[in-house]
C-alpha cells in the first residue's frame, strides 16, 4: 500500500511522541559521537518537516524516502569529517548506497566514557526539572552505545525508566526504591542489546534464510499447536521487522512490529494458549510480553517424524519440489516436539538432514541411503548435553566468580591474541551461563545455555571483527552461525602463540582498588589473570590458582593497611617477584 508521503504515513501511524523518540534513536545509532543537543536539534527539524507533510502530503520533498530525508539531515552535521573521518565519505553517495555506508560505520565498541550514575537526589531533581529532556537523554545514551538496540524495545525500556523515577522520586527512601530498578533495567538492557545484535549479525552476515530458519525453530518451540502455515506467516512478518530495524529503518520496524502484535492477538486461538495476558496489555508491554512468552503445551498426540521424513517413498520428490518448504516443515515438526533442545541444535539437525538428502536423492537407492539419517543426530544431540552437564557441575563446584576465572583461562589459551578487555568481558558473560541456566531442570538447560552462549559468542565475533587479530576467531565466527559454539569449544591451546613480554607495570596496583565495587575489583583481578596467561600460556591451573590466591591476599592486606599506597608499592614488588618465580618467568 503505497503512500504519497512515507514520512507523513509513519508520523500518523506512530504518533508524535514515538516518532520523535525513534528518530532520535536512529540518529544516535548512526552518529554515535554527536552531542545530545545536536541530535535534539536534528530531530526537531525532522519532526517539524513531518508535520508539514501530514498537513499536505504533496508539499515539497514529502515524497522522498525516509533514507533520503534522514541521510540528508545527518549529512548537514558540520563536524562530520573531523568527528567521524571516513564516514563523511558516505555523504557523497546516493541512496541506497549512502545508508549502507552509514550502517557499515556503526561501531559496536564506541570510544565513549562509561556512564556514571549520579546521586539519586541529583537524578530526581533532573527528572522533575525537565522530564522530557531527561528521558530523551536516556534514549540517546543507550542508543549511541548500542547501535543495534531493538528500537521499539528501547521505547519499552524508556517507559519503565520513566515509571521507576515517577514512583521512586516520591518515595521515603528514594535510593532503596530506585537503585534496584535501575540495576534491573541496566542488566536487562545489556541482555536485550546482545540478543538483538545476534539477530542483526544473522541477517547481515548469513542472510535472510539463516534468520528465517532460526525463527521457524524458535516459533515452533513457542507455538507448537500452531499450524505450519501460521508459523510461516509469523516468520515472514518477524523477518521483515528485524530486517528493518537492523537496517536502520526504525519507523517502519516499530510500525510493523505493532501490526504483528495486533495480528498475533487477533489470531491467538490458532497460535498459542499462553498469549491471553500479553494481549490485554498496552502496545509496548504487549509486544515485549509476546516476545518473551513461555512455550505453549505440545499437542497431545504427535506422531514419529520417521513416517514423513524417512519412511515415505516421496521424501526426495517432496524435497525436490520445494526444498526450503520441505526443510522448513522438517524444522517445524522437529522443533515443536523438542522444546528441550537449543535452537542452534535444531538448526544443526536440519542442516544434517538437508546434507543427507542432497547426497541421497542423487544416489541409486535414495531410501536405502537416507534410511538411517536419524542415527547421525545422536552425537549432535549428546555433545551439547554432555558439555552442559560438565560445565554445570564445574559451576556448582566453583561458584560464579571462580567459574568465570576457569573460562578466562580456557579462552585466553584458545585465543590469546584477543585483547584483554574483550577476553574479560566475554568470559565473564560466558560464566554467567551458570547462574542463569544451571538452576533449571534438565529439559530447560540446553535451550537456556546454548542459545545464551550463541549470544555471548556473537559479542566476541562483532568485537573481533572491528580489529581482527586471530584467524581462529575469524574462522569460528564466519564459517557457520550454528556451529560457532562447537567451533570455539573444539579449540585447543594455541601452540603458535608467542608469549607476551613480561611488563611489571601490568601488575602494579594502587590504593584506588580498595574503593572499587566488588564487581570492579573482580574485573581488575580477572584482567591480571588474563595477562598472566598471556605471559605464561603453559601455566598449570595450580600455578595460576596459587598466584591468584596470593594476589587476593595482597589486595586484602593493603586495603586494610594504614598507609595503603606504600603497602601496594612495597608488597606489590614482592608479589610480582614471587609470581615470576612461581610461574618460571
Amino acid at each position: 500500500d503505497a503512500h504519497k508521503s512515507e514520512v507523513a504515513h509513519r508520523f500518523k501511524d506512530l504518533g508524535e511522541e514515538n516518532f520523535k523518540a525513534l528518530v532520535l534513536i536512529a540518529f544516535a545509532q548512526y552518529l554515535q559521537q554527536c552531542p545530545f543537543e545536536d541530535h535534539v536539534k536534528l530531530v526537531n527539524e525532522v519532526t517539524e518537516f513531518a508535520k508539514t507533510c501530514v498537513a499536505d502530503e504533496s508539499a515539497e520533498n514529502c515524497d522522498k524516502s525516509l533514507h533520503t530525508l534522514f541521510g540528508d539531515k545527518l549529512c548537514t552535521v558540520a563536524t562530520l569529517r573531523e568527528t567521524y573521518g571516513e564516514m563523511a565519505d558516505c555523504c557523497a553517495k546516493q541512496e541506497p548506497e549512502r545508508n549502507e555506508c552509514f550502517l557499515q560505520h556503526k561501531d559496536d565498541n564506541p570510544n565513549l566514557p562509561r556512564l556514571v550514575r549520579p546521586e539519586v537526589d541529583v537524578m530526581c531533581t533532573a527528572f522533575h526539572d525537565n522530564e522530557e529532556t531527561f528521558l530523551k537523554k536516556y534514549l540517546y545514551e543507550i542508543a549511541r552505545r548500542h547501535p543495534y538496540f531493538y528500537a521499539p524495545e528501547l521505547l519499552f525500556f524508556a517507559k519503565r525508566y520513566k515509571a521507576a523515577f515517577t514512583e521512586c522520586c516520591q518515595a521515603a527512601d528514594k535510593a532503596a526504591c530506585l537503585l534496584p530498578k535501575l540495576d534491573e533495567l541496566r542488566d536487562e538492557g545489556k541482555a536485550s542489546s546482545a540478543k538483538q545484535r545476534l539477530k542483526c549479525a544473522s541477517l547481515q552476515k548469513f542472510g535472510e534464510r539463516a534468520f528465517k530458519a532460526w525463527a521457524v525453530a524458535r516459533l515452533s518451540q513457542r507455538f507448537p499447536k500452531a499450524e505450519f502455515a501460521e508459523v510461516s506467516k509469523l516468520v515472514t512478518d518477524l523477518t521483515k521487522v528485524h530486517t528493518e530495524c537492523c537496517h536502520g529503518d526504525l519507523l517502519e520496524c516499530a510500525d510493523d512490529r505493532a501490526d504483528l502484535a495486533k495480528y498475533i492477538c487477533e489470531n491467538q486461538d490458532s497460535i498459542s494458549s499462553k498469549l491471553k495476558e500479553c494481549c490485554e496489555k498496552p502496545l509496548l508491554e504487549k509486544s515485549h510480553c509476546i516476545a518473551e512468552v513461555e512455550n505453549d503445551e505440545m499437542p497431545a498426540d504427535l506422531p514419529s517424524l520417521a513416517a514423513d521424513f524417512v519412511e515415505s517413498k516421496d521424501v526426495c520428490k517432496n524435497y525436490a519440489e520445494a526444498k526450503d518448504v520441505f526443510l522448513g516443515m522438517f524444522l517445524y515438526e522437529y522443533a515443536r516436539r523438542h522444546p528441550d533442545y537449543s535452537v542452534v541444535l535444531l538448526l544443526r539437525l536440519a542442516k544434517t538432514y538437508e546434507t543427507t538428502l542432497e547426497k541421497c536423492c542423487a544416489a541409486a537407492d535414495p531410501h536405502e541411503c537416507y534410511a538411517k539419517v536419524f542415527d547421525e543426530f545422536k552425537p549432535l544431540v549428546e555433545e551439547p548435553q554432555n558439555l552442559i552437564k560438565q560445565n554445570c557441575e564445574l559451576f556448582e563446584q566453583l561458584g560464579e566468580y571462580k567459574f568465570q576465572n576457569a573460562l578466562l583461562v580456557r579462552y585466553t589459551k584458545k585465543v590469546p591474541q584477543v585483547s584483554t578487555p574483550t577476553l574479560v568481558e566475554v568470559s565473564r558473560n560466558l560464566g554467567k551461563v551458570g547462574s542463569k541456566c544451571c538452576k533449571h531442570p534438565e529439559a530447560k538447560r540446553m535451550p537456556c545455555a546454548e542459545d545464551y552462549l550463541s549470544v555471548v559468542l556473537n559479542q566476541l565475533c562483532v568485537l573481533h571483527e572491528k580489529t581482527p587479530v586471530s584467524d581462529r576467531v575469524t574462522k569460528c565466527c564466519t564459517e557457520s552461525l550454528v556451529n560457532r559454539r562447537p567451533c570455539f569449544s573444539a579449540l585447543e591451546v594455541d601452540e603458535t602463540y608467542v608469549p607476551k613480554e613480561f611488563n611489571a607495570e601490568t601488575f602494579t596496583f594502587h590504593a584506588d582498588i580498595c574503593t572499587l565495587s566488588e564487581k570492579e575489583r573482580q574485573i581488575k583481578k580477572q584482567t591480571a589473570l588474563v595477562e598472566l596467561v598471556k605471559h605464561k600460556p603453559k601455566a598449570t591451573k595450580e600455578q595460576l590458582k596459587a598466584v591468584m590466591d596470593d594476589f587476593a591476599a595482597f589486595v586484602e592486606k593493603c586495603c586494610k593497611a594504614d598507609d595503603k599506597e606504600t603497602c601496594f608499592a612495597e608488597e606489590g614488588k614482592k608479589l610480582v617477584a614471587a609470581s615470576q618465580a612461581a610461574l618460571g618467568l
Partner: nanobody, 124 residues
Framework: EVQLVESGGGVVQPGGSLRLSCAAS????????MGWFRQAPGKEREFVAA????????YYADSVKGRFTISRDNSKNTVYLQMNSLRPEDTALYYC?????????????????WGQGTLVTVSS
C-alpha cells in the same frame, strides 16, 4: 522422576504369545511417549515399538510389524506389549522407556527414563 517396572516376561515356545506390562510411578505417563526396546545377549539394544502420548499413533520396528501390538492405559499409568507368533530371535531382555520429548520414536537417546528389563526366552 518416573520409575518404570516391567513384568510379564518368561519362557515360551516358538509361535506362542506373551503380554508384557510396564507400570510407571512417580509421574503420570500421559505426557510421555512410551517405547519398548530389547537387547539380545551380545547384541546392541534395539527399538521394538512405541506409542504416542494419548495412544493415537503407534510405531514398530520392521522385524515385529504385524506380530506385536503396543497399547497404553493412561488411567492405570501402564503400557503393554502384546507379542504374538514369537520366534527364537525375539529372545532378549525387554526394556520399557519413557520420553518427555520425542521426534524419532525409534531413537534410544530420545527417552529419559528406563526400566530394569524383563527377560523373554523363546525356545522349544
Amino acid at each position: 522422576e518416573v520409575q518404570l517396572v516391567e513384568s510379564g516376561g518368561g519362557v515360551v515356545q516358538p509361535g506362542g504369545s506373551l503380554r508384557l506390562s510396564c507400570a510407571a510411578s512417580g509421574s503420570t505417563i500421559s505426557s510421555y511417549v512410551m517405547g519398548w526396546f530389547r537387547q539380545a545377549p551380545g547384541k546392541e539394544r534395539e527399538f521394538v515399538a512405541a506409542i504416542s502420548r494419548s495412544g493415537g499413533y503407534t510405531y514398530y520396528a520392521d522385524s515385529v510389524k504385524g506380530r506385536f501390538t503396543i497399547s497404553r492405559d493412561n488411567s492405570k499409568n501402564t503400557v503393554y506389549l502384546q507379542m504374538n507368533s514369537l520366534r527364537p530371535e525375539d529372545t532378549a531382555l525387554y526394556y520399557c522407556a519413557a520420553g518427555r520429548y520425542s521426534a524419532w520414536y525409534s531413537q534410544s537417546y530420545e527417552y529419559d527414563y528406563w526400566g530394569q528389563g524383563t527377560l523373554v526366552t523363546v525356545s522349544s
